[in-house]
Structures are given as C-alpha cells and as structure tokens.
C-alpha cells in the first residue's frame, strides 16, 4: 500500500504497570497505542505470544478494544502457573511497530502451614514473656498481628512490643494470662496460628 | 484450537530406547507443565513424570527415575519423552498431558502405541 | 506415595441409574483430586477438578464430593455415552487410582 501522508508508525501512549494479583481475582494490563492506520495490538509473556479470546472464546484473557489485556481470573496452579510472567504489548502498522516497557505480573500468595507455630510459655507475675512466631510463606511478605483469647492486642500499650514475630510482653501480669493467637496477613487474605496459653503464676 | 499432537506407533526391541513428540498449539506452551501419562493394554494409568516447558526442569517418579528423559524445544512448541532399556512391560499407549492452572490434566494428546517385541 | 484406592472397580447399571464411584487417598489431599473418564481406544477426558468443579463442557450430571481423604463421583442420571472406565487422580503427587469400568446391566 503506497504511503499516505498523513499516515505515521505507531507508539505506546499508555505502558503496562507491575501488578500483584490474588488467584482467582479479574486484572487488567493496560496498552493504548496511537498511529495511522490504527495500529494492531498484541502481547507477549517472557517472549511467547499470548493466546486471547480472539485466538481461542474459551480463553481467560480478553484483548480489549483499547489494546488493554483483560484476565477474567488469574490462573495460577501449584504447577503450572500460565499468566505469571513478564508482559510487553506491541503495536504494529505497516509503517512499523512499537513495544511497550515490560510489566511483571505476580500472583500473591498466602499458604496454610506457618513456619513456625507459637508454643505454650509458663512465667512468673512481673518477669518478661515472649511468644514467637513465624508466619507461612506467603507473597507479598506476610505481616503479623497477634490476638489474645480472639481479640486484636493493641501494641500501643507501653508494656508489650510487637517485634517481627515476637511479641513481648514485659512486667507480666495475671490478667495477661491466656490463649495467643498470630495472625499472618497480606493481599491474599489472613491465616491463623495454633494457639498458644500463656500461663502466669504468682510467686 | 488447544491441542496436543503426538507422534507415530512405534515397534522396538527389548534393551532400546523410544522417544515420542507431543507437539503443543493453540496456547502458551511455557505456561503449562507438560505431563507424560503410560496405559498398558487393558490396565490403568500410569503417571510418568512433568516437565516445565519453561526452564527444563523435570520430575518422575521413583519407578521411571534413571529410565527416562523428559526434554523440550520451546522455538517449536515440542515436548518430548525418552525411554531406555525397554521391556516388554513396557509396551503401552503414552500419553502427553497439560497440566492446567486448576492442577489437572485438561488437554491430552491423542496417545502413541508403543510396542517392545523380540 | 499417596495412595489412591478406588471402588468399586466395576459396576453394572442401567441408563438412568443414579452411580456413585468413591475414591479414598492413604493421607490428606486436601481437596487435590481430580476426576476423569476415558473410553476404550480415546484419551482421558478431565471431568471434574479440585473435587468439586465442573469442567467446562462436561454435563452437569456429573458432580464431585469430598475433601481430605474421602470422595465421590456422582452421575445423577447414566445416559448411554456414560459407559466408560472413570479414574481419580490427586494432584499433589499426581498418582491414578486404578479405575472404575461402568458397564451395561
């Protein structure tokens, strides 16, 4: 086709952004390209061509109109793990085409089993006691919280300290005594420790 | 269309080796875990072992560990599976099998016959 | 290895029959377990997936139960195209049980 010349190569006006998805969750990685004619989009993960509903209806990702790569549910298995990845959409005229910056898909994640449970602690009334824990592996990194007897500890009270996943109780009294609980939190959701009693005695 | 295509009947001999293609179109094939899935004539399935399209990593079962080789060529989309030392309990149907997002096998190649006679 | 013991290992019904196969795992899957069906000369066909969830395109006869180490495949009406060897399989260590042939009363 001879060259019109109003006619122009495209390029990306609108790049792909990083994102982290929970399993299961819908997401969008936007693309928006400019050119004469109207320049066609496609993606890539880690170099491959990716596969849309206008390749196979049944597919989960969706090319939008705008050039957008629509996901109806991340799909993300203990295996097989087919929308993480690294993306670039590129528009293509026949004047020439244009990629965009890569954007990092990652699946967040929050597993069951913590690395490390808390375990029951016997103190004496007025000593310091320290429950640890650790939560499971989780991406991103879970955060901890801990509940005593199901309720949320405020760390805010100048006689406990949340550090990493230790809990520090200084100057324990009997009112501290009771059922422990960590919590491991992020994106994905929340996960439960087995309890721990802290039991204080009097001297 | 998602399909796995895989190669001829094969005839060999005990003490050789056999290697069967599983040709993968329609998706993207260092996405999905590729599985190889054995069926001797008139018994159950046998799961053989994965291998991840994407870095070449592989994993079999005790049974097969030594025996077979599970490589891939990700320019042609093409998984392949290599077994030694045939037997004649070896002869059987093999299948190549995607592992989906969901931890299943949803998309099956159509089997190769694989017979090992003297 | 997980184990997996399916039963029964046959059974004879009749179109419109209600059948239930079982499937037990020798330690907790989780709900890790797959269901499919395979008839004589084809591949396998992925019927029911994570326990519970319909494959899409299969019938919706056919449902999935269980968690743990115990679970059911249910055809709430056998229809003619039914008769096949049905397998479980879980997908932690991705083991078949051995396979339950339905056949024609």
């Known amino acids: 086709s001879r060259l019109r010349q109003e006619d122009f190569p495209p390029r990306i006006v609108e790049h792909p952004s990083d994102v982290i998805v929970s399993k299961g969750e819908p997401t969008t990685l936007n693309c928006k390209a400019e050119g004469r004619p109207t320049p066609t989009i496609e993606w890539y993960k880690d170099g491959e061509r990716v596969e849309t509903d206008k390749d196979d209806p049944r597919s989960h990702r969706m090319l939008l109109p705008s050039g957008s790569l629509f996901f109806l549910r991340i799909v993300h298995g203990r295996r097989s793990k087919p929308d993480e990845g690294s993306y670039v959409c590129v528009a293509r005229n026949y004047l020439g085409e244009a990629v965009s910056r890569n954007a990092s898909l990652e699946v967040a994640l929050l597993r069951d089993d913590f690395r490390q449970n808390p375990t029951d602690v016997v103190v004496a009334a007025g000593e310091p006691a320290i429950l640890e824990c650790q939560p499971p592996r989780g991406h991103p990194e879970p955060t901890i919280y801990w509940k005593k007897d199901k309720v949320r500890i405020d760390d805010k009270e100048e006689r406990i300290s949340i550090r990493g996943g230790k809990l520090m109780i200084s100057n324990t009294r009997k009112s501290d005594a009771g059922m422990y609980t960590c919590v491991g939190t992020n994106m994905v959701g929340e996960r439960d420790s087995d309890p721990a009693e802290l039991t204080v005695f009097e001297r | 269309e998602v399909q796995l295509v895989q190669s001829g009947a094969e005839v060999k001999k005990p003490g050789a080796s056999v290697k069967v293609s599983c040709k993968a179109s329609?998706?993207?094939?260092?996405?999905?875990?590729m599985h190889w899935v054995r069926q001797a004539p008139g018994q159950g399935l046998e799961w053989m072992g994965w291998?991840?399209?994407?870095?070449?990593?592989?994993e079999f079962p005790q049974k097969f560990q030594g025996r077979v080789t599970m490589t891939r060529d990700t320019s042609i989309t093409t998984a392949y599976m290599d077994l030694s030392r045939l037997r004649s309990d070896d002869t059987a149907v093999y299948y190549c099998a995607r592992e989906s997002g969901d931890d299943a096998f949803d998309i099956w190649g159509q089997g190769t016959m694989v017979t090992v006679s003297s | 290895d997980i184990v997996m013991t399916q039963s029964p290992s046959s059974l004879s019904a009749s179109v419109g029959d209600r059948v239930t196969i079982t499937c037990r795992a020798s330690q907790s899957i989780s709900s890790y377990l797959n269901w499919y069906q395979q008839k004589p000369g084809k591949a396998p066909k992925l019927l029911i997936y994570a326990a519970s969830s319909l494959q899409s395109g299969v019938p919706s006869r056919f449902s999935g139960s269980g968690s743990g180490t115990d679970f059911t495949l249910t055809i709430s009406s056998l229809q003619p195209e039914d008769f096949a060897t049905y397998y479980c399989q879980q997908s932690v260590g991705l083991f078949f049980g051995g396979g339950t042939k339905v056949e024609i009363k």
């Open positions: 291998i991840n399209p994407k870095n070449g990593d592989t």
């Open positions: 329609g998706y993207t094939f260092t996405g999905y875990y």
